[in-house]
């Protein structure tokens, strides 16, 4: 006996009460694949969730988080509080990054500033709570006598005017 249900397309369900006729999914439900014997209830985006995509007969609703929160988990199953740049989220809420660390996003943890000296470079721009340090040329590149495209200007003693 051929299973007539396999002919039922997405957006319908196989109604056993009606001789395996394909019936459309009732309001607020969907079936994303063919051959379904039931339709799934649409997800409701409420509370801290807002609707990113409405539910249709063939696909579930997609939720996003309201302003001040960001999605966590598969399919935005949770909303986590945003912090400001320069902060990280702890058990006691948003806390400023400790000295020597930064966070340039509204989520995630504070990360240590780049250690320029590990790459043999010097600090060009100091780090802040919101920004990493910017590494520049190595100290050796900046010392007098180092080869460069333009020769360094002659050194003068402070307080002496050029001859």
């Amino acid at each position: 006996l051929q299973d007539l249900c396999s002919n039922c397309p997405a957006g319908t369900f196989c109604d056993n009460n009606r001789s395996q006729i394909c019936s459309p999914c009732p309001p607020n439900s969907f079936s994303s694949a063919g051959g379904q014997r039931t339709c799934d209830i649409c997800r409701q985006c409420k509370g801290v969730f807002k609707t990113r995509k409405e539910c249709s007969s063939t696909s579930n609703a997609e939720c996003d988080c309201i302003s001040g929160y960001h999605c966590l988990g598969a399919e935005c199953s949770m909303c986590e509080q945003d912090c400001k740049q320069g902060q990280e989220l702890t058990k006691k809420g948003c806390k400023d990054c400790c000295f020597g660390t930064f966070n340039d996003q509204k989520r995630g943890i504070c990360r240590p500033w780049t250690n320029c000296s590990l790459d043999g470079k010097s600090v060009l721009v100091n780090g802040t709570k919101e920004r990493d340090v910017v590494c520049g040329p190595s100290p050796a590149d900046l010392s007098p006598g180092a080869s460069s495209a333009t020769p360094p200007a002659p050194a003068r003693e402070p307080g002496h005017s050029p001859q």
């Epitope: 949770m78 909303c79 509080q81 809420g93």
Partner: nanobody
Framework: QVQLVESGGGLVQAGGALRLSCAAS????????IGWFRQAPGKEREGVLC????????IYADSVKGRFTISRDNAKNTVYLQMNSLKPEDTAVYYC??????????????WGQGTQVTVSS
């Protein structure tokens, strides 16, 4: 069954004060955080304040700093939102919600039905 019920809303003049209550039934608030959210007409819902199970307070909305405070009375299974120096822009439906922790909300969290606060100028 599990329920959160808000009360204490009403009409108040700008500069006035209100104290909202969020009473829990069907479960104990001892191990739950309680957050207050609000939704003004035509606007997205926004977080206001939250108090953790240990009493730590998180302020979500900078605009309420120094004006709104949150407290809990575990013996009465109730959390309070004290709103002072009210402004017309505080007009909204205020909801309480019981997440596990103040920083993270899921679709399983219990929400109240809301209480209307209207601030007239």
């Amino acid at each position: 069954q599990v329920q959160l019920v808000e009360s204490g809303g009403g009409l108040v003049q700008a500069g006035g004060a209100l104290r909202l209550s969020c009473a829990a039934s069907g479960f104990t608030l001892d191990y739950s955080a309680i957050g207050w959210f609000r939704q003004a007409p035509g606007k997205e819902r926004e977080g206001v304040l939250c108090i953790s199970s240990s009493g730590d307070v998180t302020i979500y909305a900078d605009s309420v700093k120094g004006r709104f405070t949150i407290s809990r009375d575990n013996a009465k299974n109730t959390v309070y939102l004290q709103m002072n120096s009210l402004k017309p822009e505080d007009t909204a439906v205020y909801y309480c919600v019981a997440p596990r922790i103040c920083s993270t909300y899921s679709s399983d969290d219990y929400w109240g039905q809301g209480t209307q606060v209207t601030v007239s100028s």
